[in-house]
Structure formats: structure tokens, C-alpha cells
Amino acid sequence: ATKLTEEKYELKEGQTLDVKCDYTLEKFASSQKAWQIIRDGEMPKTLACTERPSKNSHPVQVGRIILEDYHDHGLLRVRMVNLQVEDSGLYQCVIYQPPKEPHMLFDRIRLVVTKGFSGTPGSNENSTQNVYKIPPTTTKALCPLYTSPRTVTQAPPKSTADVSTPDSEINLTNVTDIIRVPVFN
């Protein structure tokens, strides 16, 4: 079996996680993509997904999660704003390709959020932060709810520095509430 690698991010409450998931342009540009959390021994849970087919550079917001799919660059940008300690956990990007099981994009993200606001969020207030104050318009999300049994994960061994995934649910709005965010200037 392929050894799944992890990248660890240690951030403070209130900061923004800002990561990218690269994919093969030719195969997956318009495929629907999702951001999932993986809890030990459970099937991955989809927290947010792009539209189907995925639109180029079109931001989709689900609660504190913002996804942007850049087709020209084979890159899905994922941001989780205003991080909370409960957001700590293991995350992954996947590409939906029914009827096949989702295709995972390496690497997984081990997020560790600690108490204590650092003074500035991951994205500074005069750039992307002001976008989140725009009144939302919502539509229904179309995230597939299926997960193949084969995607149930055996959690990799954690180092002593890692924080285990909390049992409490992440404080997000209902996954069916999709918010359109204007493209940034």
C-alpha cells in the first residue's frame, strides 16, 4: 500500500489555513473536488465541495471554508478562516469521479490549532479578510454523500507532537449552505 504522507500546520486560533491541492490538469480540471476531514477509524467526511462541473476560479464558501479551483494551474485552493482549536485534525482534498471512488490528492494536512490569538490572521485584514464580511447568497450544495468502504482509513501513527482529532464536530454551517464569494480584486 502507498504510504500516505502528511504535512503538519501549526496555527493559532483566529488565523487562516491556506493550502493548495495540485491535480493533473488534463484529467481533472472540471471534476468536482472536495475538502474532507478524516477521523480515526471513520470514513472521510466531506465538509465542502466545488460545483459540478467545477467552475474555474469561482469561489465557493461553506461556513468558514472557502474553495477555489484554478483550472489553468491544476490547483485547488482551500482556506479555513478564523480557525478554532476544535478544527485540529487530519484533512484531505479529493476529486469525485463517480462511479469510481474519490481520488485523493496528496498530501494530507495535519492541522494543529492552539489557543492564543497571534495578533494577525493568516491572511491580513486589508487583503482577503474583508471578503468574509460580504452578505452571503446561498444555494444548495451538491456534494455527493457516498464514500466507498475502501476509503475508511487506518490512521497513521501520530508523533507525540501531534494533537489527536477531537471528537467534537467542527463548527461549520450546514454543508448544504453554499455561499458565493466575489472573485478578489
Epitope: 477555489e68 496528496f106 487583503s127 480584486n185
Partner: antibody, heavy 125, light 107 residues
């Protein structure tokens, strides 16, 4: 071979603005992260801010908030750093530096792997 | 902001010596750390990324180690061209921050 070529030295009056350019060649510009770092005479390196051209939005160090504007023009593979309300303590060498896109999720995974030659900005009355 | 503290601020060494420079982050940064070398009147040059990976073209006498908050740059056998100032830098989160630098001088 990726190269970053910066604009020439500038002498400015206090209170004025300076705009330094950084042209990239030989690599992927849009999905790189471009940072601006300055170094005052005899001092260490100080990160001012950065931009990922395809996203267009910049991040700035608190110290420069409101005084610095970082932009990028994908069509010419050029990044710009404009610093306003100049004072004598802004006299420094200003560098642009690139963090190449990686298979990793961190935009800066390879660190600042390519640097421009530096632009000397002198602020004097 | 994450503070990066480098030590020592300067050191004197001879050609062939083993040199160690340390860098401490004020909070955990996993392995998101880079090391740079800078010579007078020149732009910095990247040596190490991701705490321990050698940048392409950098001699193998340079090595990096550490994760979390404590990191080390080691030059196994100092060469004449290695006399310079070395900086660490974190890129776990914005704003990116540098250490104050360590100047390696000839004894």
C-alpha cells in the same frame, strides 16, 4: 533557469513613494509566491509582504500595513512593490524573492529559492 | 507573529571546523523552516528548505535538522567560501519571519 530582475536604484525625498519592479523569466510565475524582503544597512532581513499572482491578493507584515502595496501583472510576469510615505529609515536594499509552486500544499514549501539582485532605495532630503 | 531567535549572533571559526547554528521559533512551525546564506553586497542564497532538505546545487557539507521549535544548521567542514551571514526563516504562517542572523567570521 529562473531569474528575477529588479528595477534600478532610486533616490527619494521623505514623504514620497517608490515603486520597485521584479520581472521573472524562465519559470512559472502565476502559481509561484513572490515575496518582498528588505535589508537596511548593516541590518538583517525583514519580510514586507507577498503575493501569489494567480490569486491576486497580497499579505503584508503588520509593520508595513497601509504603506505598502504589492501587485503582480501575469501578462508580463512582473511583480511590483510600492512603498509610500517614505522616511529616512526606509533606506534599504529591497529584494524580491520567489517561492516556486510545489506538489506540497504549502506555497512556500521550497522556501525563497530564487532572489532578485536587489534594488537600493535611498531616502534623503 | 512568530519570533525567530538565532544563536550565536556571530562566531569565529577556521577552515575545516564543524559549525553549528541554532534557530528557535516562538511557537511550533512543524518543519516549515528555511536557511539562507548571504555574503556582503549580495542577495541571500537558499541553502535548506523544509528544515532538512538541501536546495539544488548546495554542497552536502550543509545540513539542517529539527522540527517544532528548535532547528539547527550544520556546516560539517567549513570552507573559505562559507564565511558569510546565515539566516533562518519560518513559513508556517504569515507574516513570514526571519531570525536575526549569524555572522560566521574567520578566526
Amino acid at each position: 533557469q529562473v531569474q528575477l530582475v529588479q528595477s534600478g536604484a532610486e533616490v527619494k525625498k521623505p514623504g514620497s513613494s517608490v515603486k520597485v519592479s521584479c520581472k521573472a523569466s524562465g519559470g512559472t510565475f502565476s502559481s509561484s509566491a513572490i515575496s518582498w524582503v528588505r535589508q537596511a544597512p548593516g541590518q538583517g532581513l525583514e519580510w514586507m509582504g507577498g503575493i501569489i499572482p494567480i490569486f491576486g491578493t497580497a499579505n503584508y507584515a503588520q509593520k508595513f500595513q497601509g504603506r505598502v502595496t504589492i501587485t503582480a501583472d501575469e501578462s508580463t510576469s512582473t511583480a511590483y512593490m510600492e512603498l509610500s510615505s517614505l522616511r529616512s529609515e526606509d533606506t534599504a536594499v529591497y529584494y524580491c524573492a520567489r517561492a516556486s509552486q510545489s506538489r506540497s500544499s504549502n506555497y512556500y514549501y521550497y522556501g525563497l529559492d530564487v532572489w532578485g539582485q536587489g534594488t537600493t532605495v535611498t531616502v534623503s532630503s | 507573529d512568530i519570533q525567530m531567535t538565532q544563536s550565536p549572533t556571530s562566531l569565529s571559526a577556521s577552515v575545516g571546523d564543524r559549525v553549528t547554528i541554532t534557530c528557535r521559533a516562538s511557537q511550533g512551525i512543524s518543519s516549515w523552516l528555511a536557511w539562507y546564506q548571504q555574503k556582503p553586497e549580495k542577495a541571500p542564497k537558499s541553502l535548506i528548505y523544509a528544515a532538512s532538505s538541501l536546495q539544488s546545487g548546495v554542497p552536502s557539507r550543509f545540513s539542517g535538522s529539527g522540527s517544532g521549535t528548535d532547528f539547527t544548521l550544520t556546516i560539517s567542514s567549513l570552507q573559505p567560501e562559507d564565511f558569510a551571514t546565515y539566516y533562518c526563516q519560518q513559513y508556517n504562517s504569515y507574516p513570514l519571519t526571519f531570525g536575526g542572523g549569524t555572522k560566521v567570521e574567520i578566526k
